[in-house]
Interface confidence: medium
Amino acid sequence: YDFTNCDFEKIEADYLRTISKDLITYMSGTKSTDFNNTVSCSNRPHCLTEIQSLTFNPTPRCASLAKEMFARKTKATLALWCPGYSETQINATQAMKKRRKRKVTTNKCLEQVSQLLGLWRRFIRTLLKKQ
């Protein structure tokens, strides 16, 4: 999906208002500075591409993030403020219908959410610069 035509200001507002709280709650007892940020992004569409990938694409050591509250809110925000986004996600959603039991938060998942926090902060900084 091409995030170029999203309403970035609205996405920022949703993040500041609610998604950030869910990310921080998930990270309770740790913080983004506890992990090295290895993922970065250069502009707003690129940041959203990376955020989508880290939030919704399962990795071998962290498969369950898409079911977390912050992920559900991220999905709703992107569907609301990125034209045509929800249509591109229908196939991906159906592939996830086989629900797994929620796993205990692993260190790898914490690391991944830490990367997400870094990407969101980068997204906001690029927004402040009005690139």
């Epitope: 500041l16 950030s20 709280k21 921080i24 913080k31 506890d34």
Partner: antibody
Amino acid sequence: EVQLVESGGGLVKPGGSLRLSCAASGFTFSDYWMHWVRQAPGKGLEWVGHIKSKTDAGTTDYAAPVKGRFTISRDDSKNTLYLQMNSLKTEDTAVYYCAREIYYYAFDSWGQGTLVTVSS
Amino acid sequence: SYELTQPLSVSVALGQTARITCSGDNIGSKYVHWYQQKPGQAPVLVIYGDNERPSGIPERFSGSNSGNTATLTISRAQAGDEADYYCQAADWVDFYVFGGGTKLTVLG
């Protein structure tokens, strides 16, 4: 421009009740977690409690000294936050601020405050 | 319950750098915010998320946070910076905790 305006403060006797209001404008009130914070004369800031947005279930949390005596509610149709204070004690005397929460649990907008004096 | 400790007062010469500390057990694992409050006025957020500045806050204000201490740094202090400063952090038991406040005096 974000604006928060508190009202309803005044003098009340110990054991009495008071209801504070906070009128919000300049933002989509229903989307935000809203708080009450108080400051006793010459003292520091003390968090009283908050109410989450409806999308976050609209639940409330309270600081230990006011739990069971104070109730926070909101009317999103009127863009108004409320603090119902019952069984008031002299130590509840303070300026009461309403505040909007944003980003990592910080308060980015505050009202001007309303003074509540509990005295016999 | 979680506690945040601040010095009661800090003095700084006009144009010099002021540092206000906020101590708490493993505070580095929490996000810390700083508020400025002038007499008779409501608090104003000057730093959030350890080191981020809201729009309208001068670059002279900065923050850091690691270990057991968070620090608010005000460089090139001005007379208008004289105020009470409060740190705040979210603790998962006490929800929202404020430090006791620090009175900043700008000398000269």
